[in-house]
């Protein structure tokens, strides 16, 4: 048979951050190539990454069309140089991926503190609105554009001179916190989607501290 040296893909895994979405699988091919297909539950199959020797396929362009849909992918294995060959049942070997719903499952990318400004005993901390790969009307939408009120941020802040952390939450991209006069503070933020059951939190942003370039200090 044409498939004697062909093995089915396995360990199909979705890797997705801010909707940049790649399907990965094993094994590294030996005398075989792969083609990937993707579909929504109710839709037709669309082929991607034709006859590739890679073990990953970027499916971002397909899933960003409707991030709230649930997707299924499958990876077909073909003998190298003989891609018309089929298995004993008359079709090439393939393996299905787990289902994937981008809106519920894409990882939240590491956020960035855009700026902070102190006015007296208050500090305003602003979180950068990360760009996603979801595109509408030739414009890339931001994380807030996609998730709206589902997205909140948690701020961790502490005096530079101590290790005791305080937290604040916002469902916008800004925090206004009270600080002690004359003290320098450090800040880190985390994106959170509380309604999720998986991948609820991003990694923490890089730490930014007062007295460094990014912030602005105004004594009033």
């Amino acid at each position: 048979s044409g498939t004697t040296n062909t093995v089915a893909a396995y360990n199909l895994t979705w890797k997705s951050t801010n909707f940049k979405t790649i399907l990965e699988w094993e094994p590294k091919p030996v005398n075989q190539v792969y083609t990937v297909q993707i579909s929504t539950k109710s839709g037709d199959w669309k082929s991607k990454c034709f006859y590739t020797t890679d073990t990953e396929c970027d499916l971002t362009d397909e899933i960003v069309k409707d991030v709230k849909q649930t997707y299924l992918a499958r990876v077909f294995s073909y003998p190298a140089g003989n891609v018309e060959s089929t298995g004993s049942a008359g079709e090439p070997l393939y393996e299905n991926s787990p289902e994937f719903t981008p809106y519920l499952e894409t990882n939240l990318g590491q956020p960035t503190i855009q700026s902070f400004e102190q006015v007296g005993t208050k500090v305003n901390v602003t979180v950068e609105d990360e760009r996603t790969l979801v595109r509408r009307n030739n414009t890339f939408l931001s994380l807030r554009d996609v998730f709206g009120k589902d997205l909140i941020y948690t701020l961790y802040y502490w005096k530079s001179s101590s290790s005791g952390k305080k937290t604040a939450k916002t469902n916008t991209n800004e925090f206004l916190i009270d600080v002690d006069k004359g003290e320098n503070y450090c800040f880190s933020v985390q994106a959170v989607i509380p309604s999720r059951t998986v991948n609820r939190k991003s990694t923490d942003s890089p730490v930014e501290c007062m007295g460094q370039e990014k912030g602005e200090f105004r004594e009033i």
Partner: nanobody, 129 residues
């Protein structure tokens, strides 16, 4: 959820102008994108315009682009629709909606995390010829 109240509708002659307002009460107005939709008698509700949470991005239906302008004032929790060069076919009840920008642009496709957002009660715009 935010509560929305539209105002500014009325009767105007073709070629005239109106400015609609949508005042929001409730928490975190600036977490929401805002959209204007309209529904003419016997027709389905249709998208008119949307603005992102920060006001940095605006989107328009082809039928109103160049004539209507959407804007927002996050300090006043209000979104506006400036309507110029009005036509009889602009006659409809105009509604504002608070949701994610994605949901406003895509409409109600359903699926996880989707709801209909927050809607106001609407304001009537009538354009006479």
């Amino acid at each position: 959820e935010v509560q929305l109240v539209e105002s500014g509708g009325g009767l105007v002659q073709a070629g005239g102008s109106l400015r609609l307002s949508c005042a929001a009460s409730g928490r975190a107005f600036s977490a929401y994108a805002m959209g204007w939709f309209r529904q003419a008698p016997g027709k389905e509700r249709e998208f008119v315009a949307a603005i992102s949470w920060s006001g940095g991005s605006t989107y328009y239906a082809d039928s109103v682009r160049g004539r209507f302008t959407i804007s927002r004032d996050n300090t006043k929790n209000t979104v506006y629709l400036q309507m110029n060069s009005l036509k009889p076919e602009d006659t409809a009840v105009y509604y504002c909606n608070a949701d994610s920008l994605l949901s406003l642009l895509d409409g109600s496709r359903g699926g996880p995390g989707t709801d209909s957002g927050s809607w106001g009660q609407g304001t009537q715009v009538t354009v006479s010829s």
